[in-house]
């Protein structure tokens, strides 16, 4: 068993038909030493009486809020939450996996740039009584600060028969240096509770691994005279990180008819111009990656070629 | 050439063959995702590499105020990562494919690093693995770790170059 | 070609060393590693220890460790191994071989210890 | 030191016959696994490398089978000029150790 926060209590299960469960001693936040009786949740059963009780808990039914009282006056609160194990493993049933890049992925997280901020999300069907905390920190012998902010809702979607929701937060380290070879990385935990079920989910990574620019801004085409050919012009987004003689990016520019069948054509420059030619019903969508390191590729940004 | 007395590299020929590097670093491993194997037992071969850290100056205001601390730097990693090239993490079984883009990248460290500091002169303070012989079976591990530590290497020593290339091209 | 090419025949008395070369042509010579091992009459195969030409390195079997010395010269692409304090049960077919699993392996050398 | 125990010994075996020699090693070692076939007065020959990978040259009727501690080499119809000495050969870890070997004869 361990404190989670004040007043509230993770008790670690074994779980499996029989198991003989975790004994738990409670003890009551008061000078009183006597005329203490305990009770859970909303009943008002006694389950025993004095300033300690000690408890088998076996099964959700034995989680949930202690309160020891006197005389019809609240001492105090203990929230005693189960987190289950299995054949050797902790439970994920809060979040879904969402299986990319690989398979037990619960926490995905993007950087638009190195200062050091990023994203991080996680998906669930669950959608009451279910509350998330989320710390971090850069290594885990010696952390160095990152501060999250509180986790919002912040997509939902059906799937389905099933509602999705999506959960975001923010973090920022706090001491970022943008132009280092990070040599310790990222970790996220995020601790979630569902009912009287404690879960909690970890991600470490570079920031250099998670980075995906946004999209190529100001994307304009200008034609060159008695020629099919376009100059496809566009500018860096202004969330990267600058100066762009040292972050510098790499583009693709795509030719895109109509139809999906239609072949695309496809050239990639450093350059934030390129010459295309332009079929009729087409688009030119123009995306972003890191030019030294391989992370993701921005979204497209496109215009129409007519 | 970046002489250790202080005169400037040839930043553009930096430039080109750190950008190539970039490319060799990403083509000897590429990558779907950024496949994890970080858990996996930290070598101390991969533990002890050389970073380019926050102290270095080779961020953008360090460059311009001395280039040579983070120069020194980058030629300290791109020695050490040379000698790990061609140790018998690479060489030995299981054996590369005869075209696999790991000679060249070897061969491009080698090259930038002379570019850097020609025969004759030297920075002090070599940082060299000192390397025990690897079994065959750790083998397919360590290098996936050095790969993947010098791709972040590399990266960084490209910013430099081209950033150098750019602003402080005589 | 790519191959591997061996010293000739030796005769040694019990005592004395024997230096075998193996010339290596074909392939960069130090992007592999170079293995040398024994056969004696009738028996099979024991590995006796193995260099990294670019380095230098070497790794050697425990049983043959303070006997056996390799080494390789890589302005001429070519390993050595010297066996010292030669008995009579030293006799045998000394082989350089590249990474095993290249499967290039040099003819072999015959060496003799006989008083 | 990771042993390697080859079986059987010695076989005999006609022209066009399956043939099947095992080896078996002391601890894991995953594929890190050779075959080489000899002939008297001539170097070690290459046939299957990562246990199961067919070195380049060498005639499909060999092939490799096995991972961890148990391998098998089978020649799926024998030939003439397959008669000689198999060695199986592991390369996990130093010290690199063969097996005793096979001898594989006309019956």
């Known amino acids: 068993i361990w404190e989670l926060k004040k007043d509230v209590y993770v008790v670690e299960l074994d779980w499996y038909p029989d198991a003989p469960g975790e004994m738990v001693v409670l003890t009551c936040d008061t000078p009183e030493e006597d005329g203490i009786t305990w009770t859970l949740d909303q009943s008002s059963e006694v389950l025993g009486s004095g300033k300690t009780l000690t408890i088998q808990v076996k099964e959700f039914g034995d989680a949930g809020q202690y309160t020891c009282h006197k005389g019809g006056e609240v001492l105090s609160h203990s929230l005693l939450l189960l987190h289950k194990k299995e054949d050797g493993i902790w439970s994920t049933d809060i979040l879904k996996d969402q299986k990319e890049p690989k398979n037990k992925t619960f926490l995905r997280c993007e950087a638009k740039n190195y200062s050091g901020r990023f994203t991080c999300w996680w998906l669930t069907t669950i959608s009451t009584d279910l509350t998330f905390s989320v710390k971090s920190s850069r290594g885990s012998s010696d952390p160095q600060g990152v501060t999250c902010g509180a986790a919002t809702l912040s997509a939902e979607r059906v799937r389905g028969d099933n509602k999705e929701y999506e959960y975001s937060v923010e973090c920022q380290e706090d001491s970022a240096c943008p132009a280092a070879e990070e040599s310790l990385p990222i970790e996220v935990m995020v601790d979630a509770v569902h009912k009287l079920k404690y879960e909690n989910y970890t991600s470490s990574f570079f920031i250099r691994d998670i980075i995906k620019p946004d999209p190529p801004k100001n994307l304009q085409l200008k034609p060159l005279k008695n020629s099919r050919q376009v100059e496809v012009s566009w500018e860096y987004p202004d969330t990267w990180s600058t100066p762009h003689s040292y972050f510098s990016l790499t583009f693709c520019v795509q030719v895109q008819g109509k139809s999906k069948r239609e072949k695309k054509d496809r050239v990639f420059t450093d350059k934030t111009s390129a010459t295309v030619i332009c079929r009729k019903n087409a688009s030119i969508s123009v995306r972003a990656q890191d030019r030294y390191y391989s992370s993701s590729w921005s979204e497209w940004a496109s215009v129409p070629c007519s | 050439r970046a002489v250790p007395g202080g005169s400037s590299p040839a930043w553009t020929q930096c430039q080109q063959l750190s950008q190539k590097l970039c490319t060799l670093a990403w083509s000897a491993h590429p990558l779907v995702g950024h496949m994890d194997l970080r858990e996996e037992g930290d070598e101390e071969t991969t533990n002890d590499v050389p970073h380019i850290q926050c102290g270095d100056g080779c961020d953008p205001q360090g460059l311009r105020d001395n280039s040579q601390f983070c120069l020194q730097r980058i030629h300290q990693g791109l020695i050490f990562y040379e000698k790990l090239l061609g140790s018998d993490i690479f060489t030995g079984e299981p054996s590369l494919l005869p075209d696999s883009p790991v000679g060249q990248l070897h061969a491009s460290l080698l090259g930038l690093s002379q570019l850097l500091q020609p025969e004759g002169h030297h920075w002090e303070t070599q940082q060299i693995p000192s390397l025990s012989p690897s079994q065959p079976w750790q083998r397919l591990l360590l290098r996936f770790k050095i790969l993947r530590s010098l791709q972040a290497f590399v990266a960084v020593a490209a910013r430099v170059f081209a950033h150098g290339a750019a602003t402080l091209s005589p | 070609q790519v191959q591997l090419v061996q010293s000739g025949a030796e005769v040694k008395k019990p005592g004395s060393s024997v230096k075998v070369s193996c010339k290596a042509s074909?392939?960069?010579?130090?992007?592999?590693?170079m293995h040398w091992v024994r056969q004696a009459p009738g028996q099979g195969l024991e590995w006796m220890g193995y260099?990294?030409?670019?380095?230098?390195?070497?790794n050697y079997n425990e049983k043959f460790k303070g006997r056996v010395t390799i080494t390789a010269d890589k302005s001429t692409s070519t390993a050595y191994m010297e066996l010292s304090s030669l008995r009579s049960e030293d006799t045998a077919v000394y082989y350089c071989?590249?990474?095993?699993?290249?499967?290039?392996w040099g003819q072999g050398t015959t060496v003799t210890v006989s008083s | 030191d990771i042993q390697m125990t080859q079986s059987p010994s010695s076989l005999s075996a006609s022209v066009g016959d399956r043939v099947t020699i095992t080896c078996k090693a002391s601890d894991h070692i995953l594929k890190f696994l050779t075959w080489y076939q000899q002939k008297p007065g001539k170097a070690p020959k290459l046939l299957i490398y990562?246990?199961?990978s067919l070195e380049t040259g060498v005639p499909s009727r060999f092939s490799g089978s096995g991972s961890g501690t148990d391998f098998t080499l089978t020649i799926s119809s024998l030939q003439p000029e397959d008669f000689a000495t198999y060695y199986c050969?592991?390369?996990?870890?130093?010290?690199?150790?063969f097996g005793g070997g096979t001898k594989v004869e006309i019956k």
């Open positions: 050969q592991m390369y996990w870890s130093t010290p690199f150790t």
């Open positions: 260099i990294n030409p670019y380095n230098d390195g070497t």
């Open positions: 074909g392939y960069k010579f130090t992007r592999y590693v």
């Open positions: 990562g246990a199961t």
């Open positions: 071989a590249r990474n095993w699993d290249t499967g290039l």
